[in-house]
Amino acid sequence: MAPWPELENAQPNPGKFIEGASGPQSSIPAKDKEASKTNDNGTPVAKTELLPSYSALVLIEEHPEGTDPWDLPELQDTGIKWSERDTKGKTLCIFQGVGKFILLLGFLYLFVCSLDVLSSAFQLVGGKVAGQFFSNNSIMSNPVAGLVIGVLVTVMVQSSSTSSSIIVSMVASSLLTVRAAIPIIMGANIGTSITNTIVALMQAGDRNEFRRAFAGATVHDFFNWLSVFVLLPLEAATHYLEILTNLVLETFKFQNGEDAPDILKVITDPFTKLIIQLDKKVIQQIAMGDSAAQNKSLIKIWCKSITNVTEMNVTVPSTDNCTSPSYCWTDGIQTWTIQNVTQKENIAKCQHIFVNFSLPDLAVGIILLTVSLVVLCGCLIMIVKLLGSVLRGQVATVIKKTLNTDFPFPFAWLTGYLAILVGAGMTFIVQSSSVFTSAMTPLIGIGVISIERAYPLTLGSNIGTTTTAILAALASPGNTLRSSLQIALCHFFFNISGILLWYPIPFTRLPIRLAKGLGNISAKYRWFAVFYLIFFFFVTPLTVFGLSLAGWPVLVGVGVPIILLLLLVLCLRMLQFRCPRILPLKLRDWNFLPLWMHSLKPWDNVISLATTCFQRRCCCCCRVCCRVCCMVCGCKCCRCSKCCRDQGEEEEEKEQDIPVKASGAFDNAAMSKECQDEGKGQVEVLSMKALSNTTVF
């Protein structure tokens, strides 16, 4: 699909000179200027003509007010000044502050726990299928198939450490070579970035907040995808990761060491273990080709058991299977031998909710998935609200300055690298890149952290998770030490290579530009965020996997034309931006294609229609929920009353392209202005068209 012209003004810095523009570009959009204005080659710039951009893919919508949506919002302090408060007011303020801080920690704790439960839920729903992906060894020798298996498995189990441990076991037992494991590790790296993207979806209520949150989350996705796009072919051609890690292993004689301290797990486990406990070995057994494991439940029932080793007479297929003739005999029909049989005797049951329910894994998975997403969403809303009310005025200024300001002049370039170290350190502490990046997402959304600062923090998080894996590998038993260490090092050097590709030179920081572009599209068409998530993390990997099953010729036959088409679109896009004069008039824009091929507008109309029908049915339910939320949150500008208007009334009302304000539960007190007069509140009642963008969520 060609890029969308309605979103083409990708201007990171409107004040800079750009080739093809007559002068410094004003932030005032073209439609507000005179239509007769000409560019450098004398051609009149029509009202609809769009200005060029730095990036071929960054697609940014126009902003009538002339404000840059990526500017961090001013978190104004609307409360009474400290000096103006009396003693009682000051005491109350302190108590409120402490209370808010405790609540914030509480919601943050629940947020992290719900992420853990979400991972368990995904494993219950798709863990066995994920394990089966691994059991097809012939496919995994194909690097592209390996990559998508890594993506799919990690998305399904919501844990790169689970997929990594399966890979380690398979390498250790020679079911997989390190060479074949590298693309899977790369895929696992991509798969792990879905978590914070899901978290970002929860902030879809406020357009600008969502724009920032979604961009902040997808900067991780783009970094991983772009790294793979460059490094997978490089690895397939040169095997540099395999060679480099072999070299490291041979140079340094690694000894078994201590595992990384599980600081976060120590706090969250007591709670999450009361909800669900899983037997991760089942997925591993399926991956290793154990057919019996297919019928086992992932839900852990027994937590305490003792192991008895007893000598037992067991039958063997033939005398060749005997350890020695001394330990072999026959009863005339079968051959018998003595074997040490390990029998597990269960002593105590686990203490989680589902221990006594004989529900299938899928049912428990769906229940937990629903509950964890609701809790995750609720916690996120509350965190955003609390942060919004805490981060005001001076506090906000200090925090924003601390987080987003660079070092003084000669050392400005070091700031990003420090952020990488901070990201790595924080991830090492919490032992999960998903937790760290997911916790960062709402902060990006409300404007505490800029995308430019979130990017190195995310890269650091990628490094942090690999250092954790290296320590875990060092703590693994002797037989798996080498393979687990080599895989952990491959993961580490892959991320280092990615950082070297997409960070040091500001020009190469493509993930930021791409994420901002996607943020803009998703802010305008919120359904696109869901489409992106499904398309990039499920549809594309599943399609590639399906084609891999059909064999190399089919994969190449289908893949190459698609890649060539994408490259053609990309080249054409670049030419349209950089030097449109060399192109024929027809190719200077995408108007030669049908509208649905180069614009999201027709698609939006279709989705609006679908969601309108859906909205009619669940409208009254929405209104009740909205009112309850308003009561709980104490929102001043709740708009539930006109939720269920007649279609006629809706059409009569003029369409206003006001940025969609969050309804009810999504209302962010920190970000929205106080509603002084009711009239203003009434104007903000959304038309069905505008509202349709939120209904996806």
Epitope: C328, D331, G332, I333
Partner: antibody, heavy 120, light 107 residues
Framework: QVQLVQSGAEVVKPGASVKMSCKTS????????MHWVRQAPGQGLEWIGA????????SYNQKFKGRVTLTADKSTSTAYMELSSLRSEDTAVYYC?????????????WGQGTLVTVSS | DIQMTQSPSSLSASVGDRVTITCKAS??????VAWYQQKPGKVPKLLIY???TRHTGVPSRFSGSGSGTDFTLTISSLQPEDVATYYC?????????FGGGTKVEIK
């Protein structure tokens, strides 16, 4: 008590076949392996083969393979041995026996024996 | 097939004597060896299995020993009723094989 009652003596011509039976009682027929052992006059013991009545699994001494067939009828708790292409050296007492010592080939209950005489 | 070679083929001893019968296997059979007693005109009777385990009802004067390839049946004090032919048997491999037998007589 465990009892194994074998069919009566047989006189057969060389090249012919003989089918003898072993009716059991006093135990669960399908539980133990049934062995067949022969003893030529004034000679030692020779193992022919065994059958597990529960599944019908059989095992034969290569020396008799192709000539001997062991079967078991669970309904009557009777085991059968058929020996074909008889030769004069097949003249012997044929015993059916069971091993109640699970997993071993040591037989502890024997039938009274069936004398087969191969003579023209 | 595993050959079981018994020696002597016959022996004569006085009542109360200690009698030893040996059995040699052509290859390692572990301890999967049984001993049988067959009195003239009777069916064989199991005496010992697993080289040294006495079967139910077998007098304590009968004992077995050995492992691998060399095995021994010992009658600590020969009694008149012990007159019989004694057979060793291996059940380590199929086919099960018996020794040639040792005929024990009273002097």
């Amino acid at each position: 008590q465990v009892q194994l009652v074998q069919s009566g003596a047989e006189v057969v011509k060389p090249g012919a076949s003989v089918k003898m039976s072993c009716k059991t009682s006093g135990y669960t027929f399908i539980t133990y392996n049934m062995h067949w052992v022969r003893q030529a006059p004034g000679q030692g013991l020779e193992w022919i083969g065994a059958i597990y009545p529960g599944s019908g699994d059989t095992s034969y001494n290569q020396k008799f393979k192709g000539r001997v067939t062991l079967t078991a009828d669970k309904s009557t708790s009777t085991a059968y041995m058929e020996l074909s292409s008889l030769r004069s050296e097949d003249t012997a007492v044929y015993y059916c026996s069971i091993s109640t010592i699970i997993t071993t080939g040591a037989v502890d209950y024997w039938g009274q024996g069936t004398l087969v005489t191969v003579s023209s | 097939d595993i050959q079981m070679t018994q020696s002597p083929s016959s022996l004569s001893a006085s009542v109360g004597d200690r009698v030893t019968i040996t059995c040699k296997a052509s290859q390692d059979v572990g301890t999967a060896v049984a001993w049988y007693q067959q009195k003239p005109g009777k069916v064989p009777k199991l005496l010992i299995y697993w080289t040294s385990t006495r079967h139910t009802g077998v007098p304590s004067r009968f004992s077995g020993s050995g492992s691998g390839t060399d095995f021994t049946l010992t009658i600590s004090s020969l009694q008149p009723e012990d007159v019989a032919t004694y057979y060793c048997q291996q059940y380590s491999r199929i086919p099960l094989t018996f020794g040639g037998g040792t005929k024990v007589e009273i002097k």
